[in-house]
């Protein structure tokens, strides 16, 4: 029986050009984590295997850094990075746990966000 739960950073926003940390945490289970996959939609971003360490997909190598911990740091954000991210925990003996994070990358600076919502 799978008793564990995944806590994530939930819905987060960040500024274009900036960076963000995607974090998931598996709790309420004694299952051994053998591997964590990070995916964006159906695209593999990174893998962290307990034995083999980190692998960052070549197409993301310049903008994705492993950690902290089992998390993932996205750098040089663009508006195209907006969307769903999934942390997939492979555990033994429980099986697979999946967490979801929604990232919104905002155009430009806080000052400009303010301007966007000004009442005429």
């Amino acid at each position: 029986m799978m008793t564990g739960t995944i806590e994530t950073t939930g819905n987060i926003s960040a500024e274009k050009g900036g960076s963000i940390i995607l974090q998931c945490h598996l709790s309420s289970t004694t299952a051994q984590v053998t591997q964590v996959n990070w995916e964006q939609q159906d695209q593999l971003l990174a893998i962290c295997n307990a034995d083999l360490g980190w692998h960052i997909s070549p197409s993301f190598k310049d903008r994705v850094a492993p950690g902290p911990g089992l998390g993932l740091t996205l750098q040089s954000l663009t508006v195209n990075d907006t969307g769903e991210y999934f942390c997939i925990y492979h555990t033994y003996p429980d099986g697979t746990y999946t967490g979801r994070i929604f990232l919104e990358v905002l155009e430009s600076s806080v000052a400009e966000h303010g301007a966007r919502f000004q009442i005429p």
Epitope: Q35, D51, L52
Partner: antibody, heavy 119, light 110 residues
């Protein structure tokens, strides 16, 4: 260019010992996973041992059950060289021994060194 | 006996598409990543496919890897005489903490 060069193979009697070396160039051996894989004459590939990078799991080592307790993988970071100390050798250890670099797939291999265990 | 089963031999004619299978028990396929190696006669193995379907730089796109159900496979399209070699599938076993290789498939180009 990344290269691996094995040496140290030869003819040894059952129960004897040999130390294989894998000299590497083009990368820092301590920062990468390096494995030993063997191939008995006319047979397929068999994984022997892996040394992980020092920045993951403190350079933990892994062994196939068939060699556990008899073989020891080690590294000399200053020489950028990997070793396989083989003790209590058996006839079934006769094979070409390759060292190979990589964690998510072994992407660079040496040319191999031949170990023959026979009386 | 390996937990990965490959046909001992396969063959095809130049220009043909050939598929080499590698089957395992259910518990291995779904959550594992698979790798394919090519070993030309008298040479060391070469990584052909990693993480199920990714090609290292320098590997022609004639080679492709896929995974479905209880089997993974390597497809070679536009078969060439220089593709005659032994092909091995492999995966890292998280419980044994080691690499597991299939028995290998000898590909003959007729």
């Amino acid at each position: 260019e990344v290269q691996l060069l094995e040496s140290g193979g030869g003819l040894v009697q059952p129960g004897g010992s040999l130390r294989l070396s894998c000299a590497t160039s083009g990368f820092t051996v301590s920062d990468h996973y390096v494995s030993w894989v063997r191939q008995a004459p006319g047979k397929g590939l068999e994984w022997v041992s892996t040394s992980s990078s020092t920045n993951w799991n403190d350079g933990r080592t892994y062994y196939a059950d068939s060699v556990k307790g008899r073989f020891t993988i080690s590294r000399d970071n200053s020489e950028n060289t990997l070793y396989l100390q083989m003790n209590s050798l058996r006839a079934e250890d006769t094979a070409v021994y390759y060292c190979a670099k990589g964690s998510y797939g072994m992407d660079v291999w040496g040319q191999g060194t031949t170990v023959t265990v026979s009386s | 006996q390996s937990v990965l089963t490959q046909p001992p031999s396969a063959s095809g004619t130049p220009g043909q598409r050939v598929t080499i299978s590698c089957s395992a028990s259910n518990s291995y396929i779904g959550t594992k990543y698979f790798y394919w190696y090519q070993q030309l006669p008298g040479t060391a193995p070469k990584l052909l496919i990693y993480l199920d379907s990714q090609r290292p730089s320098g590997v022609p796109d004639r080679f492709s890897g896929s995974k479905s159900g209880t089997s993974v496979s390597l497809a070679i399209s536009g078969l060439q005489s220089e593709d005659e070699a032994d092909y091995y599938c492999a995966f890292w076993d998280d419980h044994l903490h080691g690499w597991v290789f299939g028995g290998g498939t000898k590909l003959t180009v007729l």
